[in-house]
């Protein structure tokens, strides 16, 4: 199964989850660190506002489970958020899900390796309970806590690699690219949007690869 | 393109030491954890232990515990798994692969066979 | 205990569906991952993280879970799935891998 297999139209697209908009967008008062996508985003400002809150109303997530998260590990997950709410440049990496809460997830979007590796690095020193944080919580309080049995541990006890935090942490919603920033061949979490998107570039390629790889199997399976 | 090549097929006399290598390449070898696994002929699939690629830590099943250490070459993007006091039963292709995320092996070496006989 | 246990051996018709299953309390709390093993051949992981589909893995095959059971569905099974499958998990007490004993899948017809 590829990528996007479930979409034909992969370019400027929001995904069908629960706050997206079902267009992307100018959107001119983004918030913080989210403000990156404020020239076309798929999240509103008040998602944007929210995503930003310990335990926000979005998802009743909290990033404390295990005491204080530190900060510079925090802006990460942040960011994380920012990609996932805001971004219109993951429609490759769109698949269909029947989930009670959304329609649509991202998997393996090819994160650029040094926001994995800084990712992994500034959160050496947190504390949680989980290696994957869709599942397994215990929410009976209506915010996620620890499960029974589930220690608080440092961040590298459960992700002992950068890849095992990237890729196992939202159940493969990433992979870890080989590329690196700037190649346009991986999505940066992090950018200067001074600059324009980055992340445009990365879409169109991948999509463009995409269509001929379908090309490809259309061609194989006429003759055959 | 990932790919992980691992040395030739090893026959061992019982008592003696074996040491596999698992060269890996098109990935960043220090982002992921490799793991050993191995398969006696006709028998499922055994975990040995794993290597952090990063900082060289390592995990090994209680039952190889003693016996097995994983080791890692990162200038040469390389491990190691060495078994020592080799018995009959220890006969078996031995397996590395990469891990994604605790388990999700999606790379998988080709399979070194060690025979261990008098 | 950290076992994952599995039918030593199922079979399905040409075309047919067919289910199998992982058991063990690791899953509970921890995604089971799914390989096929042909004969002389290294193993191929056919899903991870419980549902998702490996690049090149026909979507015939899908993964699902309830409680501390795993299932690999393979809807309209081909004479290419006849092979062996394994489950794996995670167990979080010491960051250790378990593997199932395995199921032989016969594909009839």
């Known amino acids: 199964a590829d990528p996007g297999q479930d979409r034909t139209d992969l370019l400027n697209v929001c995904m069908d989850a629960k706050h997206h908009k079902t267009k992307p967008g100018p959107e001119d008062k983004l918030h913080d660190q989210c403000s990156p996508w404020k020239k076309n985003a798929c999240c509103t400002a008040s998602t944007s506002q929210e995503l930003h809150k310990d335990t926000s109303r979005l998802y009743n997530f909290n990033w404390d489970h295990c005491g204080k998260m530190e900060p510079a590990c925090k802006r990460h997950f942040i960011q994380d958020t920012c990609l996932y709410e805001c971004s219109p440049n993951l429609g490759p990496w769109i698949q269909q899900v029947n989930q009670s809460w959304r329609k649509e997830r991202f998997l393996d979007v090819p994160l650029c390796k040094e926001d994995c590796q800084r990712w992994w690095e500034d959160c050496h020193t947190s504390h949680t309970c989980k290696s994957n944080w869709h599942r397994g919580w215990d929410w009976t309080s209506g915010v996620n806590k620890c499960p029974a049995g589930a220690l608080c541990r440092t961040f590298e006890s459960y992700f002992p690699t950068p890849a095992a935090l990237c890729e196992g942490l939202w159940s493969h919603s990433y992979k870890v690219s080989n590329y690196s920033r700037g190649s346009g061949r991986c999505i940066q979490m992090w950018f200067d949007s001074a600059q324009g998107n980055p992340n445009e570039e990365v879409a169109r390629f991948y999509a463009a690869a995409m269509h001929v790889n379908a090309g490809e199997m259309l061609h194989h399976h006429h003759h055959h | 393109e990932v790919q992980l090549v691992q040395s030739g097929a090893e026959v061992k006399k019982p008592g003696a030491s074996v040491k596999v290598s698992c060269k890996a390449s098109g990935y960043t070898f220090t982002y992921y954890a490799m793991h050993w696994v191995r398969q006696a002929p006709g028998q499922r699939l055994e975990w040995m232990g794993w290597?952090?690629?990063?900082?060289?830590?390592?995990k090994y099943s209680q039952k190889f515990q003693g016996r097995v250490t994983i080791t890692r070459d990162t200038s040469a993007s390389t491990a190691y798994m060495e078994l020592s006091s080799l018995r009959s039963e220890d006969t078996a292709v031995y397996y590395c692969?990469?891990?994604?995320?605790?388990?999700?092996?999606?790379?998988w070496g080709q399979g070194t066979l060690v025979t261990v006989s008098s | 205990s950290s076992e994952l246990t599995q039918d030593p051996a199922v079979s399905v018709a040409l075309g047919q569906t067919v289910r199998i299953t992982c058991q063990g309390d690791?899953?509970?709390?921890?995604?089971a991952n799914w390989y096929q093993q042909k004969p002389g051949q290294a193993p191929v992981l056919v899903i991870y993280g419980q549902f998702n589909l490996p690049s090149g893995i026909p979507d015939r095959f899908s993964g699902s879970s309830s409680g501390n059971t795993a299932s690999l569905t393979i809807t309209g099974a081909q004479a290419a799935d006849e092979a062996d499958y394994y489950c794996?998990?995670?167990?979080?007490?010491?960051?250790?891998?378990?593997f199932g004993g395995g199921t032989k899948l016969t594909v009839l017809g």
């Open positions: 794996d998990s995670r167990v979080s007490t010491g960051n250790h891998v378990v």
């Open positions: 692969a990469r891990d994604i995320s605790y388990g999700s092996f999606d790379y």
């Open positions: 290597i952090n690629a990063g900082n060289g830590n390592t």
């Open positions: 690791s899953l509970r709390s921890n995604y």
